[in-house]
Interface confidence: low
C-alpha cells in the first residue's frame, strides 16, 4: 500500500510528536494546518530529531516532497550561516543540524523561499518557491508529558486504538501525548476508554490501571500478576506485591526498590524514591551524595573523649595524657592509680541520664559554664570563661574549610572536670563546631537524641545561636536526629546568611526537553553558583523562622523551607551545525551565544501545546516579533491570530508571479 495514499501518521517521544500529513498544500496552507492542530511545521534542529523524522517519513517515493518549518524572506541571504538566512517558523535560527541537498547558491535571493524535505533517501532539504503545492507536510507537536502505549492483555479483542489531541487515530504509537484517548475492545464485549491525564503525584499517566478487560479472574495465569492476584467485587483483578516490594508501572510486576538502588551500605524500601539509604554505625551519608557513606569523625564531637581522641574508619578511641589512665568506660581519664575523675563522672551522668526530664536536663545544661576549644587532631575542654566574641557564622561550603570562630588560645594540660558525652557511635557528627551537616545520621534509637554539652552563661535571646531542626521526611522516625544544641555567643540571627541544606527531601527529575528517547537540551549547560548541590535538584534554602515556637529554651529554630533558588545559566556553548552534505568541517559555523536559548527547562512554566513547538529553544525574551502571514500583498486578509503565548514567526506568502518573470529558477527545487 502506498503510504502517500494513506492517512496521516505520527511518531511520538515522551515530550513531542512529529506527524506526517500526505496532503498537497502550499507552504502557507501547511503552516496554517499545523497551527490549527496546536502544533507547528516540523523543526528538526538536532541529529536525534532528524533521526525521528527519518523513521516517520520512511522510504517515500523518490520525487515526493514535504514542507518543514523553514522559510526565508526575499533578499535575506546569509549564505555563511548554517541556515543560510532561513528562519524556523518558531521565529529563531538556532540549530545543531542541517541537511541541505545542495551547496548554497551564490545568488542575490530575490524571492521568498521555503524548505521541503525529500521523502526518500537521506531526506535532504531543498529550497524552493513557497507558493508551490508539494506532496505533504510535517508537523511537530510539543506537550507536557506522554503516556507509554498500553500493554496488550489476554482478554483484548485487538490492539488499543489511540486518538491524539491532534486528531490522529492509530494503533501504532509507542508514546501517547497528554490528552490522548486509548480505546480498548475486550473479547467479552465490553470495552474501556482511558485518558492520558496528569497524575496527582506529578507527571502524566493513564486514567486507569490495567487489567482493562474482564477475564477469568486470577486464573489461569494469576491474573498476569507477578506476586499476589486479588479478584475485586466488579470482576476486575488487581495485583499486589509482597512486603518489601512495590508494584511496577505496568500494574502487574513487582520491583524490589533496593535491587537497583545505588546505596553503598544499607537500603530500606520506602521514601519518595522508593528506597532510602542508610549507613552503618560509625558512618554517615556523604554530603555530596546521600547514597554513599563516609566515616564519622567522632573526634570532632565536643567531649566525646575526656582528653585525647583518635578516629578510625567506623569508630574512635580515647586516650589519656601521660600520668593519667583510661577508665573502664573507655572515655574518662583519671590520674594513674586515683579516682580524680569522679566529679566529672557525676556531672556527665547527670547531663546524659536517659531518665532525666527536660527541666532537670536544662538545669544541668546551665550548671557548667566552661568553654571548649579545639586543637588540631585533639578535642579537649577548658573551664575558662570565654570572651564575649561575635561568631562569624557561615554556611559550610567547600571553600570554607573551617568555621571562622575566634577561639581563645588553648591551654595545656587538659582539665579533668570537663563534661562529656557517653560512648555512643550514634552521636551526631559535627565536623565543624557550629555548622550542622544536614545529612542522615545513623541513629539506632529515637530515644537517645545526642546532646552536645558545650554551654556558656545564659545569653539574651539576641545572642543565641539558632538551633537547626533537621527534618528528614523520607526517614522513619527512628532515624530522625535529635536536636543539636550548641550555644555560643553569636551575632543576632538577622545578620546570619541563610544556610543551604544539602538534603533534598523530594528529588524530582528536571523538566526535560522534547527529545526521544533520552531527553536533553542541546547547547545549554546549566551551572549554579552553589558548591556541592547537584545541578538537577532544587536546593533547599533554610530560612529563619523567628515567629515559630522555639524548639528548646532560649533557642531560635531554623526550619527548612523548600524555597527554589534562582538558577542562573552561565554562558552557553554555541550550537553547531551537523551537515550530512559533503561539506568540509571548515564550513561549520557556530551560532553565536546570543542566539542561544535563554530559558532553562527546569524553570519553565507549564506551557500550552502551542508554546512547545520548538524542542530546543524555549521562547526567547529577545525573539523577534511575529511576522504576519501575507497572501498576495502586504495587508493580512486572514485572521490567523491563534492563541499562543509564544512569539512565533508566521510565514509570509508573497505574490511571486511577478518575481518569477525575473528569475526562472524560482519555481524549481534547487
Amino acid at each position: 500500500q502506498d503510504p502517500w495514499a494513506a492517512e496521516p501518521r505520527a511518531a511520538c517521544g515522551p515530550s513531542s510528536c512529529y506527524a506526517l500529513f500526505p496532503r498537497r498544500r502550499t507552504f502557507l496552507e501547511a503552516w496554517r494546518a499545523c497551527r490549527e492542530l496546536g502544533g507547528d511545521l516540523a523543526t528538526p534542529r538536532t541529529p536525534e530529531e532528524a533521526q525521528r523524522v527519518d523513521s516517520l517519513v520512511g522510504a517515500g517515493p523518490a520525487s515526493r516532497l514535504l514542507w518543514i518549518g523553514l522559510q526565508r524572506q526575499a533578499r535575506q541571504c546569509q549564505l555563511q550561516r548554517p541556515l543560510r538566512g532561513f528562519t524556523w517558523t518558531t521565529g529563531d535560527q538556532d540549530t545543531a543540524f542541517t541537511n541541505w541537498a545542495q551547496p548554497a547558491s551564490g545568488g542575490p535571493c530575490p524571492a521568498q523561499r521555503c524548505v521541503a524535505l525529500e521523502a526518500s533517501g537521506e531526506h535532504r532539504w531543498l529550497e524552493g518557491s513557497c507558493t508551490l503545492a508539494v506532496d505533504g507536510y510535517l508537523c511537530q507537536f510539543g506537550f507536557e508529558g506522554a503516556c507509554p502505549a498500553l500493554q496488550d492483555e489476554a482478554g483484548q479483542a485487538g490492539p488499543a486504538v489511540y486518538t491524539t489531541p491532534f486528531h490522529l487515530v492509530s494503533t501504532e504509537f509507542e508514546w501517547l501525548p497528554f490528552g490522548s484517548v486509548a480505546a480498548v475492545q475486550c473479547q467479552a464485549g465490553r470495552g474501556a476508554s482511558l485518558l492520558c491525564v496528569k497524575q496527582p503525584e506529578g507527571g502524566v499517566g493513564w486514567s486507569r490501571a490495567g487489567p482493562l478487560c474482564l477475564g477469568t479472574g486470577c486464573s489461569p495465569d494469576n491474573g498476569g500478576c507477578e506476586h499476589e492476584c486479588v479478584e475485586e467485587v466488579d470482576g476486575h483483578v488487581s495485583c499486589r506485591c509482597t512486603e518489601g516490594f512495590r508494584l511496577a508501572a505496568d500494574g502487574r510486576s513487582c520491583e524490589d526498590p533496593c535491587a537497583q538502588a545505588p546505596c553503598e551500605q544499607q537500603c530500606e524500601p520506602g521514601g519518595p524514591q522508593g528506597y532510602s539509604c542508610h549507613c552503618r554505625l560509625g558512618f554517615r551519608p556523604a554530603e555530596d551524595d546521600p547514597h554513599r557513606c563516609v566515616d564519622t569523625d567522632e573526634c570532632q564531637i565536643a567531649g566525646v573523649c575526656q582528653q585525647m581522641c583518635v578516629n578510625y574508619v567506623g569508630g574512635f578511641e580515647c586516650y589519656c595524657s601521660e600520668g593519667h589512665e583510661l577508665e573502664a568506660d573507655g572515655i574518662s581519664c583519671s590520674p594513674a592509680g586515683a579516682m580524680g575523675a569522679q566529679a566529672s563522672q557525676d556531672l556527665g551522668d547527670e547531663l546524659l541520664d536517659d531518665g532525666e526530664d527536660e527541666e532537670d536536663e536544662d538545669e544541668a545544661w546551665k550548671a557548667f559554664n566552661g568553654g571548649w576549644t579545639e586543637m588540631p587532631g585533639i578535642l579537649w575542654m577548658e573551664p575558662t570563661q570565654p570572651p564575649d566574641f561575635a561568631l562569624a557564622y557561615r554556611p559550610s561550603f567547600p571553600e570554607d574549610r573551617e568555621p571562622q570562630i575566634p577561639y581563645p588560645e588553648p591551654t595545656w594540660p587538659p582539665p579533668l572536670s570537663a563534661p562529656r558525652v557517653p560512648y555512643h557511635s550514634s552521636v551526631l557528627s559535627v565536623t565543624r563546631p557550629v555548622v550542622v551537616s544536614a545529612t542522615h545520621p545513623t541513629l539506632p534509637s529515637a530515644h537517645q537524641p545526642p546532646v552536645i554539652p558545650a554551654t556558656h552563661p545564659a545569653l539574651s535571646r539576641d545572642h543565641q545561636i539558632p538551633v537547626i531542626a533537621a527534618n528528614y521526611p523520607d526517614l522513619p522516625s527512628a532515624y530522625q536526629p535529635g536536636i543539636l544544641s550548641v550555644s555560643h555567643s553569636a551575632q543576632p540571627p538577622a545578620h546570619q546568611p541563610p544556610m543551604i541544606s544539602t538534603k533534598y527531601p523530594e528529588l524530582f527529575p528536571a523538566h526535560q526537553s522534547p527529545m526521544f528517547p533520552d531527553t536533553r537540551v542541546a547547547g545549554t549547560q546549566t551551572t549554579t553558583h552553589l558548591p556541592g548541590i547537584p545541578p538537577n535538584h532544587a536546593p533547599l534554602v533554610t530560612t529563619l523562622g523567628a515567629q515559630l515556637p522555639p524548639q528548646a529554651p532560649d533557642a531560635l529554630v531554623l526550619r527548612t523551607q523548600a524555597t527554589q533558588l534562582p538558577i542562573i545559566p552561565t554562558a552557553q556553548p554555541s550550537l553547531t551545525t551537523t551537515s550530512r552534505s559533503p561539506v568540509s568541517p571548515a564550513h561549520q559555523i557556530s551560532v553565536p551565544a546570543a542566539t542561544q536559548p535563554a530559558a532553562l527547562p527546569t524553570l519553565l512554566p507549564s506551557q500550552s501545546p502551542t508554546n512547545q513547538t520548538s524542542p530546543i529553544s524555549p521562547t526567547h525574551p529577545h525573539s523577534k516579533a511575529p511576522q504576519i502571514p501575507r497572501e498576495d500583498g502586504p495587508s493580512p486578509k486572514l485572521a490567523l491570530w491563534l492563541p499562543s503565548p509564544a512569539p512565533t514567526a508566521a510565514p509570509t506568502a508573497l505574490g511571486e508571479a511577478g518575481l518569477a518573470e525575473h528569475s526562472q529558477r524560482d519555481d524549481r527545487w534547487l
Epitope: G523, Q525, T578, S579
Partner: antibody, heavy 116, light 107 residues
Framework: EVQLVESGGGLVQPGRSMKLSCSAS????????MAWVRQAPTRGLEWVAS????????YYRDSVKGRFTISRDTAENTLYLQMDSLRSEDTATYYC?????????WGQGVKVTVSS | DIVLTQSPTTLSVTPGETVSLSCRAS??????LHWYQQKPNESPRLLIK???QSNSGIPSRFSASGSGTDFTLNIKNVEFNDVSSYFC?????????FGAGTKLEIK
Amino acid sequence: EVQLVESGGGLVQPGRSMKLSCSASGFTFRNYYMAWVRQAPTRGLEWVASTGTGGDFTYYRDSVKGRFTISRDTAENTLYLQMDSLRSEDTATYYCARAYGYFDYWGQGVKVTVSS
Amino acid sequence: DIVLTQSPTTLSVTPGETVSLSCRASHSVGTNLHWYQQKPNESPRLLIKYVSQSNSGIPSRFSASGSGTDFTLNIKNVEFNDVSSYFCQQTQSWPLTFGAGTKLEIK
C-alpha cells in the same frame, strides 16, 4: 533486560565475504537506530555503519562504503552486516550497538580475522 | 571528519585520587559528546551522554563537563575497579568518531 548477541565471525580470506548477525531483545527493536562499531588493537574504536529505524536510511564510514551493507529484519529483531571484498585492515572485533546518537547498549562482540 | 584527541594516553594513579581525562575536538561538537568505559576483555559501556548527563547505574564519582571543543571526564576517589580505557565519542556529524582512548592504571 536489553541484550545484543552477535554471531557469524571467524577467519576469512581477503576478497571474500562474511555476514554478521546481531539478535536484539529486551526493547522495541523497531524504534531504535542500530549500528556496528569495530575495534582493532591498533586502531581503537571505529564506527562502521548505522541504520535508521526502518532500515531505509543507512550511513557508512568512507573506508567500507560500497563493500559493507547494514540491514535489519524488524520482524526477527535482528541486525546484519554483510561484508564483501574484505581486506586485512577489516580485522577487528565487531560490536553491535543500539544507537540513538550515543551507543547505550553494546553486544559482547564477535571477532573477524581477514588473513590468507 | 571530526577528530577527537584524548590525553593523556595512559594515566597511573593511586586509589583515592581524583583524576581528569581530556578530550579535544577538531571542530565544535556542541553538546553531542559522550564518554565510554571499557574494562579489559569487555565491551564498552556508556558512562556519560551529552557532555555531562550520567547514564543510569553509573556511580556519582564519575562526572564530566565541557562545551564546544574541550571536554573533561572526572573520576573522584579512584578505585581498583576503575582500571579501564576511557573513550570519548561525537555524534555531531557523520561519520561518528571516537577518541583513541585514555588507559587508566592503578599504581
